[in-house]
Interface confidence: medium
């Protein structure tokens, strides 16, 4: 159905008050610099507009389309040219070019410093005042900080936000209350993040069909009662959806999730067994309890794979008539039998079997030559389930920060060019599988860690992209999605690589690291660590361990004593001169 | 759930032709791959001919080819046989059977369609 006013047709369907939340998070994804108060005030006078023109659809502007009307009002900012630079000339273009510009100029990592959050009560005084303000500073901060964060996500977040102050705010202790609460949100909304970053990076750099067989695969895995029909129909609903947000047209994406919603909650009996509870919710509750339900059980009665994907004997017919079709029901039908394989895992297995029927396809006798083809699987289920097995023996014997250690001397022996802020980034985060994964049961480890690992690792080569300094990072990020874990896990140590200068400064501490929390003090250790091996890249995991106990054993030492600073330019310089003789 | 219910079977002499007709009903039949299967007396149901679903990729039996059209049509939610130089080795009951939801594959193994007519008989005698 075509519409005369683009705006107005979001303004109906969303409602205002989702309206204004989204206008907002889009325009601070786009201008991340900009004051809060400003975008408050682009915000207000957009949703202005489109509620004039939902009352008159023929006024004057109401049918330009959201790009133009968006990118006009982007263009108003005075200070684009000063805050953007270049970002400015994008204005001189016309749509689609434009906003295309404007995407490019998305930044990654702004540097913005961590959110602090203030007194409880200095919070809850400012929630209580004014509630509407204070979400809307909530989504301009999360946003401008994550400029592809899946905006109709958000505002459910931004929703949980609010249920917590409207509770801890009447709490006897606020601190308590909103401490735990809001450290918990913190943790799904870096983890929503960098999920929705790994989609729209798929989608950007590897195409819609490497988007569509991710969703399959997971969908498959959720809902083994659909059939592929009833997958395939979600799975490209589901592919407009992220590409809209990806593409920051945050309104149509709301619309369209909302919409996906309802027809998932229309055909429930068709999909799944657990969408009942999801679908009495309110739309943001609805969509995000789908995005998140448990999966359905298997159906008791599933045939052997082999019967259509080896014995038939129209097996290079199906495969020659209609390669995606075909390729799309095998990995269905293999991801709905296989609930404790990554995703990741299922990909390559359909990548192995496109191969192989590429290859027999050609030949003479097609049945002989794909006849051993599911028994040529396992090596590749072997390899993921073997790495998982190892390294939560590690992370058991080690914990979270001696673990994160081991992968931070790893990475950077593998990469070490890459700036230290992403090396120790990016192995903190691949850390935390440990914490996320290894106390799962078997069934689900493997799911869990490498499926996480191919987001935390998108954050690597999204970072690396920004400023590309190792060649072997780039052909890991670029050459195939699906094989990027399985890339970085074989690189070995870069033998090219020359040590970097020694520079004292890098080494010098002071007595602000003893007030510093406890994951910030640790951030500092593993910078240290990171540098030392820059510095000194043939270091053995034993020289590196005494070093660190020592560095450990130093910061205590002067953070208990009397006068700290005096220790720490006093002992410093000690414990590098021991750590270079130490390292040689 | 989906029903199909065959007709246009009957006495027809060799060299003749004859249509038959599936209906389907619950479910759209262009999402499904769908196929005739026969079973002559005292023998083994045997796969005929079969269509993909979304994709209109055709399966026949080498006893068959050259001689039996599939084909449906979507509008009508129907699948049809169309049966040209009929011989009296073609004498037997026709079935219509379903698998939702797997375009492409229409396999000639009987027991992975779980959706069955109740089948139309169709005779080949001068």
């Known amino acids: 159905e075509a519409y005369k006013s683009e705006i107005a047709h979001r303004y109906n369907d969303l409602g205002e008050e989702h309206f204004r939340g989204l206008v907002l998070v889009a325009f601070s994804q786009y201008l991340q610099q900009c004051p809060f108060e400003d975008h408050v005030k682009l915000a207000k006078e957009v949703t202005e507009f489109a509620k004039a023109c939902a009352a008159e659809e023929s006024g004057a502007n109401c049918d330009k389309s959201l790009h133009t009307l968006f990118g006009d009002k982007l263009c108003t900012v005075a200070s684009l040219r000063d805050k953007y630079g270049d970002m400015a000339d994008c204005c001189e273009k016309q749509e689609p070019d434009r906003n295309e510009c404007f995407l490019a100029h998305k930044d990654d990592n702004p540097g913005f410093p961590p959110l602090v959050a203030p007194e409880p009560d200095a919070l809850c005084a400012a929630f209580q005042d004014n509630e509407q303000l204070f979400l809307g500073k909530y989504l301009y901060e999360i946003a401008r900080r994550h400029p592809y964060f899946y905006a109709p996500e958000l505002l459910y977040y931004a929703q949980q936000y609010k249920g917590v102050f409207a509770e801890c705010c009447q709490a006897a202790d606020k601190a308590a209350c909103l401490g735990p609460k809001i450290e918990a949100l913190r943790e799904k909304v870096l983890l929503s993040s960098a999920k929705e970053r790994f989609k729209c990076a798929s989608l950007q750099k590897f195409g819609d069909r490497a988007f569509k067989a991710w969703s399959v695969a997971r969908l498959s895995q959720r809902f083994p009662k659909a059939d592929f029909a009833e997958i395939s129909k979600v799975v490209t609903d589901l592919t407009k959806v992220h590409k809209e947000c990806c593409h920051g047209d945050l309104l149509e994406c709301a619309d369209d999730r909302a919409d996906l919603a309802k027809y998932m909650c229309e055909n429930q009996d068709s999909i799944s067994t657990k969408l009942k509870e999801c679908c009495d919710k309110p739309v943001l509750e609805k969509s995000q309890c789908l995005a998140e339900v448990e999966r359905d059980e298997l159906p008791g009665d599933l045939p052997s794979l082999a019967a259509d994907f080896v014995e038939d004997k129209e097996v290079c017919k199906n495969y020659q008539e209609a390669k995606d079709v075909f390729l799309g029901t095998f990995l269905y039908e293999y991801a709905r039998r296989h609930p404790e394989y990554s995703v990741s895992l299922l990909l390559r297995l359909a990548k192995e079997y496109e191969a192989t029927l590429e290859k027999c396809c050609a030949t003479d006798d097609p049945p002989t030559c794909y006849a051993k083809v599911l028994d040529e699987f396992k090596p590749l289920v072997d390899e993921p389930q073997n790495l998982v097995k190892t390294n939560c023996e590690l992370f058991e014997k080690l914990g979270e920060y001696g673990f994160q250690n081991a992968l931070l001397v790893r990475y950077t022996k593998k990469a070490p060019q890459v700036s230290t802020p992403t090396l120790v980034e990016v192995s903190r985060k691949l850390g935390k599988v440990g914490t996320k994964c290894c106390k799962k049961p078997e069934s689900e480890r493997m799911s869990c860690a490498e499926d996480f690992l191919s987001v935390v690792l998108n954050r690597l080569c999204v970072l690396h992209e920004k400023t590309p300094v190792s060649e072997r990072v780039t052909k890991c990020c670029s050459e195939s999605l699906v094989n990027r874990r399985p890339c970085f896990s074989g690189l070995e140590v870069d033998e090219t690589y020359v040590p970097k200068e020694f520079n004292a400064e890098t080494f010098t501490f002071h007595a602000d690291l003893c007030t510093l929390p406890e994951a910030e003090k640790q951030v500092k250790k593993q910078t240290a660590l990171v540098e030392l091996l820059k510095h000194k890249p043939k270091a053995t995991d034993e020289q590196l361990k005494t070093v660190m106990g020592d560095f450990g054993a130093f910061v205590e030492k002067c953070c208990a004593a009397e006068n700290k600073e005096g220790c720490f330019s006093e002992e410093g310089p000690k414990l590098v001169a021991a750590a270079q003789a130490a390292l040689v | 759930e989906v029903q199909l219910l065959e007709s246009g079977g009957g006495l027809v002499q060799p060299g003749g032709s004859l249509r038959l007709s599936c209906a389907a009903s619950g479910r759209y039949i262009d999402e499904t791959a769908v196929a005739w299967f026969r079973q002559a007396p005292g023998k083994e149901r045997e796969f005929v001919a079969g269509i993909g679903g979304g994709v209109d990729i055709t399966t026949y039996a080498d006893s068959v080819k050259g001689r039996f059209t599939i084909s449906r049509d979507n509008s009508k939610n129907t699948l049809y046989l169309q049966m040209n130089s009929l011989r009296p080795e073609d004498t037997a009951v026709y079935y219509c059977?379903?698998?939702?939801?797997?375009?492409?594959?229409?396999?000639?193994?009987?027991?992975?369609?779980?959706?069955w007519g109740q089948g139309t008989l169709v005779t080949v005698s001068s």
């Open positions: 059977a379903a698998r939702p939801g797997r375009p492409l594959i229409t396999s000639k193994v009987a027991d992975l369609y779980p959706y």
